[in-house]
Interface confidence: medium
């Protein structure tokens, strides 16, 4: 779970060790603050839970790509 040390900075100290299906993901945000010990991705799931994930893992990158495509406005 992400941990807010000093609002508004949220950091991740541990990453999930389970792949989350993209069908269970609603959105994500990147954690790049120098105040945090490591770079991270926080996924928000469809049941409103927030999960820390390692941005170096392929499934995390693929999931971010998938969510990016979902949120892009269709070109007309």
């Amino acid at each position: 779970q992400p941990d807010a040390i000093n609002a508004p900075v949220t950091c991740c100290y541990n990453f999930t060790n389970r792949k989350i299906s993209v069908q269970r993901l609603a959105s994500y945000r990147r954690i790049t603050s120098s105040k945090c010990p490591k770079e991270a991705v926080i996924f928000k799931t469809i049941v409103a839970k927030e999960i820390c994930a390692d941005p170096k893992q392929k499934w995390v990158q693929d999931s971010m790509d998938h969510l990016d495509k979902q949120t892009q406005t269709p070109k007309t």
Epitope: K19, S21, T45, I46, V47, A48, K49
Partner: antibody, heavy 119, light 108 residues
Framework: QVELVQSGAEVKKPGSSVKVSCKAS????????ISWVRQAPGQGLEWMGA????????HYAQKFQGRVTITADESTSTAYMELSSLRSEDTAVYYC????????????WGQGTLVTVSS | DIVLTQSPATLSLSPGERATLSCRAS???????LAWYQQKPGQAPRLLIY???SRATGVPARFSGSGSGTDFTLTISSLEPEDFAVYYC?????????FGQGTKVEIK
Amino acid sequence: QVELVQSGAEVKKPGSSVKVSCKASGGTFSSYGISWVRQAPGQGLEWMGAINPLAGHTHYAQKFQGRVTITADESTSTAYMELSSLRSEDTAVYYCARYDGIYGELDFWGQGTLVTVSS
Amino acid sequence: DIVLTQSPATLSLSPGERATLSCRASQSVSDAYLAWYQQKPGQAPRLLIYDASSRATGVPARFSGSGSGTDFTLTISSLEPEDFAVYYCHQYIFYPNTFGQGTKVEIK
């Protein structure tokens, strides 16, 4: 340790309703979902539906749509399954089981409640 | 709905033998969101394997799961007397969740 304790056995008349409860202890109730699964005598497992209190989602199998209602009371960490218009084919053991809303495997199960529908 | 078909319906084996149970899905189970349960008479099912291949807490190493897409396997490397039971597969990626019809592992 997580424990799910279900209400006791019921004998019901055809056409009536039954409400089975499932009280959870040893975990954060609102962070998990509860599925209901039934098993007719000598038969396999049949998924009926699920509720995820955190998200407010409820899902039902088409077969039970309109006859089953799954609810949850976070204040008492209890989930309920009500099945109406009972018929003899509804005679079964009804189980509640916990799942993590992000994933979905059923990691803890209640002991089961036998519902007998007989005239 | 995803239909899960388990085979064989019954497996007659002796203690110490290897058991291989199959579960085939009518469509792909995305991200291998498939579980295996063991059920003994008069008891509730018990989770053995989740995400197709991860052992649940406290499950002996003789139980292993494999597979992806539409074909999944539960293997019991060497049957112990307490392993004779009914085994069910379960997909939890789509609603409605569905179970296979079960495979009974009985003593030969």
